[in-house]
Interface confidence: medium
Amino acid sequence: QFELEILSMQNVNGELQNGNCCGGARNPGDRKCTRDECDTYFKVCLKEYQSRVTAGGPCSFGSGSTPVIGGNTFNLKASRGNDRNRIVLPFSFAWPRSYTLLVEAWDSSNDTVQPDSIIEKASHSGMINPSRQWQTLKQNTGVAHFEYQIRVTCDDYYYGFGCNKFCRPRDDFFGHYACDQNGNKTCMEGWMGPECNRAICRQGCSPKHGSCKLPGDCRCQYGWQGLYCDKCIPHPGCVHGICNEPWQCLCETNWGGQLCDKDLNYCGTHQPCLNGGTCSNTGPDKYQCSCPEGYSGPNCEIAEHACLSDPCHNRGSCKETSLGFECECSPGWTGPTCSTNIDDCSPNNCSHGGTCQDLVNGFKCVCPPQWTGKTCQLDANECEAKPCVNAKSCKNLIASYYCDCLPGWMGQNCDININDCLGQCQNDASCRDLVNGYRCICPPGYAGDHCERDIDECASNPCLNGGHCQNEINRFQCLCPTGFSGNLCQLDIDYCEPNPCQNGAQCYNRASDYFCKCPEDYEGKNCSHLKDHCRTTPCEVIDSCTVAMASNDTPEGVRYISSNVCGPHGKCKSQSGGKFTCDCNKGFTGTYCHENINDCESNPCRNGGTCIDGVNSYKCICSDGWEGAYCETNINDCSQNPCHNGGTCRDLVNDFYCDCKNGWKGKTCHSRDSQCDEATCNNGGTCYDEGDAFKCMCPGGWEGTTCNIARNSSCLPNPCHNGGTCVVNGESFTCVCKEGWEGPICAQNTNDCSPHPCYNSGTCVDGDNWYRCECAPGFAGPDCR
């Protein structure tokens, strides 16, 4: 059953979810609810696990509600045995472990007309295993906060994570067992089988010819006998015969007849002729003795001075009689001459299947393992041999023993470790089986006996300088306050690095910003704007390139300010009639010195190199395999000695060739088997072993024996506009744009009007790498100053 217990409720203002008061109006002064409190009760809906909880739909696992259990705020944690705050949802199905729970707090209207109103609702999706332990959950958002606890318990005799394993102890015809904590049947002593209803027979009892209904018994089938039902019963009256199957009489050597009672070798069996007489078999049970000289009688037993020849063996004493002699034998011997060892094993005195060994004047029993004593009549203590490996104790049973295993072990000798890993480990953790326990190996970021807990990496407060820590799976993130950066907010941000201030201004770092101290001619946050001195100070036009203005920065009290019409690459030269010309720096040309002279016009780069125009200079980007200022030098690809096993290296363009010796193969003579390996063909080429050589099939954009040379096809036809230079880059290309142009294919005109070069509200007209100022009325000059 699923149980839920309400622990506490906090609804300080006595409000409903919709903002209204439970009991009517609000106090106009403090806006708190007045009059009576909420009459709080709870509804519960339990359903299948939903990753995104939907309020509707059936409560497929059950639903229920409490009576009114309190007002606005109450605490029931101390009240034990009070069932009013408990909802029990029995289930008649296997518990699925994962679930979604909807808990709603309601205000009872105590009115048949007015419906009840919802105060607050909580939803929780999770996984819970059956246990006596409660799991506490909290609803901490919204108008009301409440706390409740849940658990799942199995009915009596039901076990397992799904409460679907049934086990009820019994000791009757149908079974003899108890139940362990996992619901597994543990058989009582002497019983076995899945239902513990098969008796364990006497140890050694023949499985084929014996059986038992009670432990330790061994009942024989018809035709079989013995303690273990392993001996067949021969034909009744069988004398010198044995059986392999019941009722047989298979004669021993020299015996005949239906009951094996006819001696076919009387001489051999009885050796009746004494004193060296020779015996002859004359028929079944018949014989004849021919005696040596000095002896007579049917058995040559009559002798004159018979004791002279020491006829009594084995220390027997001889007495002469009228018939010849008589031997008085020492203990253990018999027969007329004391030569027969008395068979002390007849009858067999050895119990419990012991084997009798005849000795002189005695016998010895060789007992089966479970028995001991002179005649195997005593039960052997098997526990003396310490057969139990991991056990609390060893119990000696009649003809057997029992090991009482330590927790976590099983098997007759407690030598099998029980596998305690039953899927308890969560979040993809792996389980290690221990003795009477298990251990979950958590993936990074999780902890707890079952890896059920996301480790709070923020617990050690790793964020410095007031940074806010956000816990994530197996990591954390610091949200830094203004002025700090770094993964732990450990870096005090230097807003002056790199220096944002232009035109030689000094930068000063502040807690969350920077300040630029501008030189006299510049202004703006980054000192990027030329000051319009004429707005603040009267100035005098000297010529079409220069104005003068009063200044206390110079000894003469006058500062001369030059026009910037010629841009950064030229100087303004005043001409008569208000005109001007520009004197250009090396490498630039054009009216405003805005054009970079093309130093690549003479095509200085060799061997397919690409020329990039600079300022009064150029740079060659060489094709693969070439180097030098003009790409004039073939790179020596043999310099690293790539050929193994005595191979000779020949340098090619951006490649090398190994002349292999002694049966070595491959690009670098590294293999006995194949011309190809993963490094033979470059840039995604596929290698084919052609016996004496290899061949590379190159992807688009590459060619050469090992796909090492970029095809120029990506730059043909030239995709770069406005005089841009195309540089091959594998299957792709890069455009190096001329000044005044930008974008991936140099199609966008750079905005030369940024930042505002025209003063006094003049309008800027952008050209191709130049601009023109159209001045407002009353202003003139290239930059309207």
């Epitope: 953790a429 290690r432 221990l434 251990r439 190996i441 993936p443 990074p444 890896c451 617990a459 050690s460």
Partner: antibody
Framework: EVQLLESGGGLIQPGGSLRLSCAAS????????MTWVRQAPGKGLEWVSV???????FYADSVKGRFTISRDNAKNSLYLQMNSLRAEDTAVYYC???????????WGQGTLVTVSS | QAVVTQPPSASGTPGQRVTISCSGS????????VSWYQQLPGTAPKLLIY???QRPSGVPDRFSGSKSGTSASLAISGLQSEDEADYYC????????????FGGGTKLTVL
């Protein structure tokens, strides 16, 4: 801030008993795996015992039957009861929090146990 | 008795990259995650690497770990004088009923 502080070490005769304590702050002992690790003078680290949050305990073969690990949830403390001490038990004993992995993310400063006659 | 082997000593000059190896068997390193610890003279060990290659917060990215088969290694790049310490690897050992087994330790000297 997480902290572990061991105490209870000292000089003891062979065959004697000693109880080490480890007071924890900044986290709850009962909901974590807690371990004792020792280091003999001039030697390497040796794992001694662990108690799981569920209460299961495990010991190294060298101390099994002589040492007992336990905890007091109310005091948020870990203990190691050491009986039948031998000269080879001389070491600095550290308590550490063991995360499933296993790895030890927080260690105490250690307490020295000297077993000598 | 299960054994995890580390070289007794290693050395390097400042700025160099040094690697310390840790060799075990299928019952420990082969089937379980490896962690690494730094022990400065006279102090308690400190966690450097867990789960083979994960770095706890506060450990510089100069320290990195890796594992292959029954061996693991700790790499320290841009060696500094304060890295002079003893380094230990550790892993569970299944044959010891889940006991943790430490390597013998490696003394790193910065020349």
């Amino acid at each position: 801030e997480v902290q572990l502080l061991e105490s209870g070490g000292g000089l003891i005769q062979p065959g004697g008993s000693l109880r080490l304590s480890c007071a924890a702050s900044g986290f709850t002992v009962s909901s974590n795996y807690m371990t004792w690790v020792r280091q003999a003078p001039g030697k390497g680290l040796e794992w001694v015992s662990v108690i799981y949050s569920g209460g299961n305990t495990f010991y190294a073969d060298s101390v099994k039957g002589r040492f007992t690990i336990s905890r007091d949830n109310a005091k948020n403390s870990l203990y190691l009861q050491m009986n039948s001490l031998r000269a080879e038990d001389t070491a600095v004993y550290y308590c550490a929090r063991e995360m499933s992995g296993p790895y030890f993310d927080y260690w105490g400063q250690g307490t020295l146990v000297t077993v000598s006659s | 008795q299960a054994v995890v082997t580390q070289p007794p000593s290693a050395s390097g000059t400042p700025g160099q990259r040094v690697t310390i190896s840790c060799s075990g068997s299928s019952s420990n390193i082969g089937s379980n995650p490896v962690s690494w610890y730094q022990q400065l003279p006279g102090t308690a060990p400190k966690l450097l690497i867990y789960s083979n290659n994960q770095r706890p917060s506060g450990v510089p990215d100069r320290f990195s770990g890796s594992k292959s088969g029954t061996s693991a290694s700790l790499a320290i790049s841009g060696l500094q004088s304060e890295d002079e310490a003893d380094y230990y690897c550790a892993a569970w050992d299944d044959s010891l009923n889940g006991d943790v087994i430490f390597g013998g330790g490696t003394k790193l000297t910065v020349l």
